[in-house]
C-alpha cells in the first residue's frame, strides 16, 4: 500500500551498497529544516537484494534489472509518492567491482552501465552509480560512525547515546571488513602520516581532522580465504587439502578454475595437475592462524611502522568501531560483548573450530551451510588481521567495539557517502541561515575524491 504524504517536512535518500558478496539498499530519512545538524539523519529501512554481488553478473547483465527490482519496489512503498522525485538514489560499488575493473575496465563499465539504466527507470532522482575508491570507503565509514555517535556535535552531553560511547569528542576509529577488502581509518595522535596516499584532511562542523586510512584490497574475508586456499594448494601436491580452518569432518570440492578466477590469487597461481581438489577440515585454530599469517608480508616496511605488505600504519589511537563483517561474524560467534577479552575470544575460537562439522550443522540448523562452514576461518581471520595485521594487543583489544547499528542505523560507508553527496556535513558550524554550497566539506576538503 502507498503511504500518504507525511504532514511533517521530511526528506529521504537512498544508497545502494553494491558489495562483493551482495547488494543492500538503505533508506535514510531526516527533518528538512534540520539537515545541517549532526545526528539527525537516520536509517528507516534496509533491503538486502537477493543474489550475489553485481560483479557476478558480468556474463548475464540482462538479469541485473530483475535482481534490483524487489528492493527498489520496497523503496517505492516506504517513501511517500509525493517525495519520490526529490529522493536522491546513489549506488556505490566497492571492492568486488574494483577487482572486476582490474581484470577488465570494459566489463566493469558494462555492468555499471546496465545498473544505471535499471535504476534510471524508477521515479526517484537517480544520481549515478560508481565504483568508490578504497579511500572513500574508509573515510565514509569513519564519517558514518562518528556522525551517529555524535562526535561532530559541539554540544557536550552528560549522557551517552550508546553503551560504549566515551563521553568526549575524541572520534572513534573505523574498522570495516567486507568480502573483498578491509579498511582501517582513524585519527592518529600527533603522528605524521608518512604516506600521502593514506592521509585525509577534513574540516567538519568547524573542526579540522587529519585522518589516516587504508583499504586492503583482497583482504576482505572471502578473498582472504581464496588467497589462503591458493597458497596452501601450492604445497599440498595432492587433490586433498587438509585445512585447519574448517571443522573436522567438513568436506568440499573446489574447482581450480574458481580458485584462480580472482586477481587476488594471481600471486599464488601455478599449474596444478588436477582440475579439482577436496578441502577436508581438520579444525585447528592455531594451525589456521599460522596459515593466515603467511598472507601478511611483514618483512618489508619502508616506514617507521607498517601494518603488512609495506603499508604505513601509525600507532593505534583511541577507540575503534568494528563493523560490517567484523560485527556479523563476531555476533554469530557470540563474541561482541564488551566484557570478552582477546584471550577469551581466542579460547572460544579454538573450541569452535575444533567442533565436528556434523555437530555444528545440528547446533545451527537454520544457517546456510555455505556461511556456516566459513565462520571458523572468518573468526580466525578477524583475530589474525586485528592482532598481527593491525597490531592490536590484548590491552588495546578492549578499545575495539563490535558495532552493528548505532541509534538504529547500520554502521558502514553508505550514510557518510550520502551525507557528503547531499552536502549535509558542513565544514563550518551551521549558522541559523543555510550556508552556500561552497563551504561544504564535499567541495573543499574531500581530497579522497580524486580518482586513482
Amino acid at each position: 500500500t502507498q503511504n500518504k504524504a507525511l504532514p511533517e517536512n521530511v526528506k529521504y535518500g537512498i544508497v545502494l551498497d553494491a558489495g562483493s558478496s551482495h547488494t543492500s539498499l538503505y533508506i535514510y530519512k531526516w527533518p528538512a529544516e534540520k539537515e545541517n545538524d549532526t545526528g539527525v539523519v537516520h536509517q528507516v529501512e534496509e533491503c538486502r537484494v537477493k543474489g550475489p554481488g553485481i560483479s557476478k553478473f558480468v556474463q548475464k547483465v540482462n538479469e541485473i534489472g530483475i535482481y534490483l527490482t524487489d528492493c527498489m519496489e520496497r523503496a517505492r512503498e516506504v517513501i511517500p509518492r509525493s517525495q519520490h522525485q526529490e529522493t536522491p538514489v546513489y549506488l556505490g560499488a566497492t571492492a568486488g567491482m574494483r577487482l572486476l575493473r582490474m581484470e577488465s575496465e570494459e566489463l566493469a563499465d558494462r555492468v555499471l552501465d546496465v545498473v544505471e539504466r535499471s535504476l534510471s527507470n524508477y521515479p526517484f532522482d537517480f544520481q549515478g552509480a560508481r565504483i568508490i575508491t578504497g579511500q572513500e570507503e574508509g573515510a565514509y565509514g569513519w564519517i558514518t560512525i562518528n556522525y551517529l555517535l555524535g562526535k561532530f556535535s559541539q554540544k557536550t552531553r552528560w549522557f551517552s547515546i550508546v553503551p560504549y560511547e566515551t563521553n568526549n569528542q575524541e572520534t572513534f576509529g573505523a574498522l570495516d571488513l567486507g568480502g573483498a577488502s578491509t579498511q582501517v581509518t582513524f585519527v592518529p595522535q600527533n603522528q605524521t602520516i608518512e604516506s600521502p596516499d593514506n592521509a585525509l584532511q577534513f574540516r567538519l562542523y568547524g573542526k579540522d581532522y587529519n585522518v589516516y586510512t587504508h583499504s586492503f584490497l583482497c583482504y576482505g574475508k572471502d578473498q582472504a580465504l581464496w588467497q589462503k586456499l591458493a597458497k596452501d594448494i601450492q604445497v599440498a601436491s595432492n587433490e586433498i587439502l587438509r585445512d585447519p580452518c574448517f571443522h573436522p569432518g567438513y568436506k568440499k570440492v573446489v574447482n581450480v578454475s574458481d580458485l584462480y578466477k580472482t586477481p587476488c590469487t594471481k600471486r599464488f597461481e601455478m599449474t596444478l595437475p588436477f582440475q579439482q581438489f577436496e578441502i577436508q577440515g581438520i579444525g585447528n585454530y592455531q594451525q589456521c592462524h599460522q596459515s593466515i599469517l603467511e598472507l601478511f608480508n611483514t618483512s618489508y616496511c619502508p616506514y617507521s611502522q607498517c601494518a603488512f605488505n609495506g603499508i604505513f600504519l601509525p600507532p593505534l589511537q583511541g577507540d575503534f568501531g568494528a563493523f560490517s563483517a567484523f560485527y556479523f561474524v563476531m555476533k554469530f560467534l557470540n563474541l561482541t560483548s564488551e566484557k570478552v577479552s582477546q584471550e577469551k575470544v581466542t579460547e572460544m575460537m579454538k573450541k569452535f573450530c575444533a567442533q565436528p562439522w556434523e555437530e555444528i550443522k545440528t547446533s545451527y540448523a537454520g544457517v546456510k551451510e555455505k556461511y556456516l562452514s566459513e565462520y571458523c576461518f572468518s573468526g580466525t581471520y578477524i583475530l589474525s588481521l586485528l592482532l598481527q595485521g593491525y597490531h592490536f594487543t590484548a590491552d588495546s583489544w578492549e578499545h575495539i567495539h563490535f558495532i552493528g547499528k548505532i541509534q538504529g542505523s547500520d554502521a558502514g560507508w553508505t550514510l557518510g557517502y550520502m551525507l557528503n553527496l547531499t552536502n549535509m556535513i558542513p565544514a563550518e558550524q551551521p549558522l541559523s541561515t543555510p550556508l552556500s554550497h561552497s563551504t561544504y566539506v564535499a567541495h573543499h576538503h574531500h581530497h579522497h575524491h580524486h580518482h586513482h
Partner: antibody, heavy 119, light 107 residues
C-alpha cells in the same frame, strides 16, 4: 596402527630392472599421497618420487626421471616403484612414506628395502 | 631446487646436555619444514612438522623454531635414545629436499 612395509629389493645388474612395493595398512590409503625416498650407503636421505592420492600427480627427482615410474593400486593399498636402466648409484635403502597436507606430510615411514646394483 | 644446509654435520654431547641443530634454506620455505630422526637400525620417525609443531607422542624435550630462513631443532636435555641422525626436510616445493643430516653421538 599405521604401517608401511616395503618389499622387492635385491641384487640387480647395471641396466637391469626391478619393481619395489609398499604395502599400507592402518589408514585410508586412498586419501594419502605417497613418496619414495632413498638413502645410499653412508649418505643422507634423497627424495625420489611422489604420487598423489588419485594418481593424477607424479613428481620425480631429476636423477631418476625417465627411468623410474611411481604407481599405486588403491584397491590393494599398495604403492609401487618400477625401476629400469638401473645404475650403481641407485644402490640404496628405499623407503616409502605417506603424505597429506596439512599435518601428515611424510609423517610415517616404512622400514626400508635394500636395492643393490652391481655386476 | 631449494638447498637445505644443515649444521653441524655431527656433534658429540653428554646425557642431559642441551643441543641445537640448524637448517638454512636457500629460498623461502615459509615454515614448511619437518625434522626427522633416523635411528641406527634405519627406522625413520618424524619429530616436528610445520617448523615448530611437535608430533604426538614425541617427548617435550624436542622443540622446533624458526628465525627467518634458519630453522632449528633443540633437544633440551639429551637422553640415551636421542643418539641418532637428524634430518630437516622442506616441503614448500618440488623436489622435496633434505638437509645433509646431523649425527648426534655420545661423548
Amino acid at each position: 596402527e599405521v604401517q608401511l612395509v616395503e618389499s622387492g629389493g635385491g641384487l640387480v645388474k647395471p641396466g637391469g630392472s626391478l619393481k619395489l612395493s609398499c604395502a599400507a595398512s592402518g589408514f585410508t590409503f586412498s586419501d594419502y599421497g605417497m613418496h619414495w625416498v632413498r638413502q645410499a650407503p653412508e649418505k643422507g636421505l634423497e627424495w625420489v618420487a611422489y604420487i598423489s592420492s588419485g594418481s593424477s600427480i607424479r613428481y620425480y627427482a631429476d636423477t631418476v626421471k625417465g627411468r623410474f615410474t611411481i604407481s599405486r593400486d588403491n584397491a590393494k593399498n599398495t604403492l609401487f616403484l618400477q625401476m629400469t636402466s638401473l645404475r650403481s648409484e641407485d644402490t640404496a635403502i628405499y623407503y616409502c612414506a605417506r603424505d597429506l597436507y596439512y599435518d601428515h606430510v611424510l609423517d610415517y615411514w616404512g622400514q626400508g628395502t635394500t636395492l643393490t646394483v652391481s655386476s | 631446487d631449494i638447498q637445505m644446509t644443515q649444521s653441524p654435520s655431527s656433534l658429540s654431547a653428554s646425557l642431559g646436555e642441551r643441543v641445537s641443530l640448524t637448517c638454512r634454506a636457500s629460498q623461502e620455505v615459509s615454515g614448511y619444514l619437518n625434522w626427522l630422526q633416523q635411528k641406527p637400525d634405519g627406522t625413520i620417525k618424524r619429530l616436528i612438522y610445520a617448523a615448530s609443531t611437535l608430533d604426538s607422542g614425541v617427548p617435550k624435550r624436542f622443540s622446533g623454531s624458526r628465525s627467518g630462513s634458519d630453522y632449528s631443532l633443540t633437544i633440551s636435555s639429551l637422553e640415551s635414545e636421542d643418539f641418532a641422525d637428524y634430518y630437516c626436510l622442506q616441503y614448500a616445493s618440488y623436489p622435496r629436499t633434505f638437509g645433509g643430516g646431523t649425527k648426534v653421538e655420545i661423548k
